[in-house]
Amino acid sequence: LQDPCSNCPAGTFCDNNRNQICSPCPPNSFSSAGGQRTCDICRQCKGVFRTRKECSSTSNAECDCTPGFHCLGAGCSMCEQDCKQGQELTKKGCKDCCFGTFNDQKRGICRPWTNCSLDGKSVLVNGTKERDVVCGPSPADLSPGASSVTPPAPAREPGHSPQ
């Protein structure tokens, strides 16, 4: 015998209290597949979470994060604080990148500047907290007699010594 509940489409549930007829999901609930015996409660996007897509009778609400935060986890289960470029998020909040490291995004960690000399290249543009160094041509690529493009070592910025 076919289960009468299998005829209930998405957006409804099979109501055992009413002879297994298909009843619409109540407000603030949904069923995304047919044959459901209950509807699921809609996700509420509250606080730091904002509604990206409203809940419908057949699909759950989708959330993202209010400005200043970004999503983490499946389905944006968490909102993590943004930092400024040139910073990284630590247990004590946003902290400036240490000298010799950079972060060009509002999330993630500070990464070491590229070591141009490992590729036999010279530094064309110094690194900053927000930007990696730009490597120039290797000294061998320079025409004879051309002056070096390697600028002097950058002075340490006050307040940005290694922590």
């Epitope: 996700r43 606080g47 959330c63 944006c76 289960s77 968490m78 909102c79 993590e80 604080q81 909040g93």
Partner: nanobody, 121 residues
């Protein structure tokens, strides 16, 4: 039952002060941070300030630095947002949330309903 209840909002003139309270019940208050957010009419909700379980402050909004401070009284399960030199652009509904950590909020975190702050010029 978990509850966060904001109070202390009201109407104040520009340059004035208000102290908002966020009173918590139904969970181990000492283990949680408390973050304040605000939503002005027609604008995105924005983070304001947060206090960690150990008492450290995190400013989410640069615009409130030097004007707003945050403190907590674990004996009273309450966090206070002291707002001074208020400006008309501070007008908003202020609500508090209780994450484990000021830098990361979960969809399971607790939130209050909010209290209205109106700053007239």
């Amino acid at each position: 039952q978990v509850q966060l209840q904001e109070s202390g909002g009201g109407l104040v003139q520009a340059g004035g002060s208000l102290r908002l309270s966020c009173a918590a019940s139904g969970f181990t208050f000492d283990d949680y941070a408390i973050g304040w957010f605000r939503q002005a009419p027609g604008k995105e909700r924005e983070g304001v300030l947060c206090i960690s379980s150990s008492g450290g402050s995190t400013y989410y909004a640069d615009s409130v630095k030097g004007r707003f401070t945050i403190s907590r009284d674990n004996a009273k399960n309450t966090v206070y947002l002291q707002m001074t030199n208020l400006k008309p652009e501070d007008t908003a509904v202020y609500l508090c949330g209780a994450p484990r950590d000021c830098s990361r909020y979960s969809s399971d975190d607790y939130w209050g309903q909010g209290t209205q702050v109106t700053v007239s010029s």
